[in-house]
């Protein structure tokens, strides 16, 4: 999601998206200098009016939060950026199309890992995103990808594996060694996206057995 | 207790009209997946239809597209199915189904569409 | 979309017998099938998940096994009130597609 580099004073203009979070980055060129001002505009595919974003207006830092401008998941968009330093011509240069849907990247799920006795049961939280509902409320990632599913896998001593996956939020290993531990990674993957997480870790032991002390 | 009760099933000439509804009760409607799937008369069953009642966002099956519309009425708890210019072929048992805890296991009890001359 | 190949499509078992049905996935469905029974005038009712996974309330008799794209469905002991038609169900994308039943009938 690059631009060419054609200019020395910028380069590297492009969207980094991750949970439907949406910054436009960019990188100064060997001709920038610490004056070089930058400007940003957004607009939506399709549309001829360039908006420019309040915030981003002559800034120094290169970096600009579009999440609210571009969160309709469902269209399409184009931002550019314009850099301005002393004494020389403005440069302008735009991202390719950008759709958040397509191009957001999926961070490790929230996960709560509860040690029992004999088993590690999981609990995965649901994922808040930016992206509203119409009613106002922010959706989860659950709610915006149908085919999101959750791989959980539980490591012992790097010689044994167990997995689970599945669609639902709870899930337990059974048929643990007590007094033992584990190493549990989760991870998020939509297959029709191609979307995989980073896994959530989580290093957990298994309680003791005091059973035998009361026999 | 979860319930989901179909309606608005009929007999319909081919080109006609008909909107079926799914009334749900017993669970968290406004932040679910729900279904419609059809059944033709003495073969298997196909998923026509999902709706996220929260996003919006709707997938449809190939032989259907721009000819059905999925919606809900969220205030209502109310799944709905509009299906324009229906052919024979569309004749079938239609019933709705919710996913919750991530398994599709609660069906309503089916309306009949008929679509004939 | 996936296709699901199930077979055979009838089958005829004494009360007792052990009924084993498979399902084939035209691709990688991970672990995402499903099964389902339906008995005629009824909706279909979710007996195994996730393979392997049985839903609360289904007997023991009733198991799956199987991964990627092939999986079989299990009934250890045919009872009477176990005749009817079994579909098996991808769940992993979109369009979900069922496998074409088989009916499970006495000898």
């Known amino acids: 999601h690059t631009t060419v580099d054609t200019s020395g004073l910028l380069q590297h203009v492009k969207f980094q998206s991750s949970n439907f979070e949406n910054i436009l980055t960019w990188d100064g060129g060997p001709a920038s200098t610490s004056d070089t001002v930058y400007s940003v505009e957004y607009k939506k595919y399709g549309e001829r009016k360039w908006l420019a974003k309040a915030g981003c207006q002559r800034i120094t830092q290169k970096f600009c939060n579009l999440t609210m401008e571009t969160r309709n998941h469902t269209e399409f968009y184009y931002a550019k950026v314009t850099a301005v330093s002393a004494g020389g011509p403005p440069v302008t240069k735009m991202t390719d199309r950008f759709s958040s849907l397509q191009h957001t990247t999926i961070k490790p799920p929230d996960v709560t890992c509860i040690p029992k006795v004999r088993s590690i049961q999981m609990l995965v939280h649901p994922t808040l995103t930016p992206v509203l509902s119409e009613d106002g409320h922010q959706l989860t990632l659950e709610e915006i990808f149908h085919d999101l599913f959750y791989r959980l896998e539980l490591h012992v001593n790097h010689t044994y594996q167990m997995h689970l996956e599945g669609k639902q939020r709870e899930y337990e290993f059974l048929g643990l060694t007590p007094d033992t531990e584990f190493l549990g990674s989760i991870t998020i993957l939509t297959p029709i996206l191609s979307k995989e997480s980073a896994p959530y870790v989580c290093r957990v032991k298994t309680l003791p057995d005091r059973t035998w002390a009361y026999s | 207790e979860v319930q989901l009760v179909e309606s608005g099933g009929g007999l319909v000439q081919p080109g006609g009209s008909l909107r079926l509804s799914c009334a749900a009760s017993?669970?968290?409607?406004?932040?679910?997946?729900m279904y419609w799937v059809r059944q033709a008369p003495g073969k298997g069953l196909e998923f026509v239809s999902v709706?996220?009642?929260?996003?919006?966002?709707?997938h449809y099956v190939e032989s259907v597209k721009g000819r059905f519309t999925i919606s809900t009425d969220n205030a209502k708890n109310t799944l709905f199915l509009q299906m324009n210019s229906l052919k024979s072929e569309d004749t079938a048992v239609y019933y709705c189904?919710?996913?919750?805890?991530?398994?599709?296991?609660?069906w309503g009890q089916g309306t009949q569409v008929t679509v004939s001359s | 979309d996936i296709v699901m190949t199930q077979s055979p499509s009838s089958l005829s078992a004494s009360l007792g017998d052990r009924v084993t049905i498979t399902c084939q996935a035209s691709?990688?469905?991970?672990?995402?099938i499903d099964w389902y029974q339906q008995k005629p005038g009824q909706a279909p009712k979710l007996l195994i998940y996730?393979?392997?996974r049985l839903e609360t309330g289904v007997p023991s008799r009733f198991s799956g096994t199987g991964s990627g794209t092939s999986f079989t469905l299990t009934i250890s002991g045919v009872e009477a009130e176990d005749l009817a038609t079994y579909y098996c169900?991808?769940?992993?994308?979109?369009?979900?597609?069922f496998g074409q039943g088989t009916k499970v009938e006495l000898k």
């Open positions: 189904a919710t996913r919750i805890q991530g398994l599709i296991d609660y």
């Open positions: 017993g669970f968290t409607f406004s932040s679910s997946w």
């Open positions: 709706i996220n009642t929260r996003s919006g966002i709707t």
């Open positions: 691709q990688s469905i991970r672990s995402f």
């Open positions: 996730g393979t392997s």
């Open positions: 169900l991808q769940d992993y994308s979109w369009p979900l597609t």
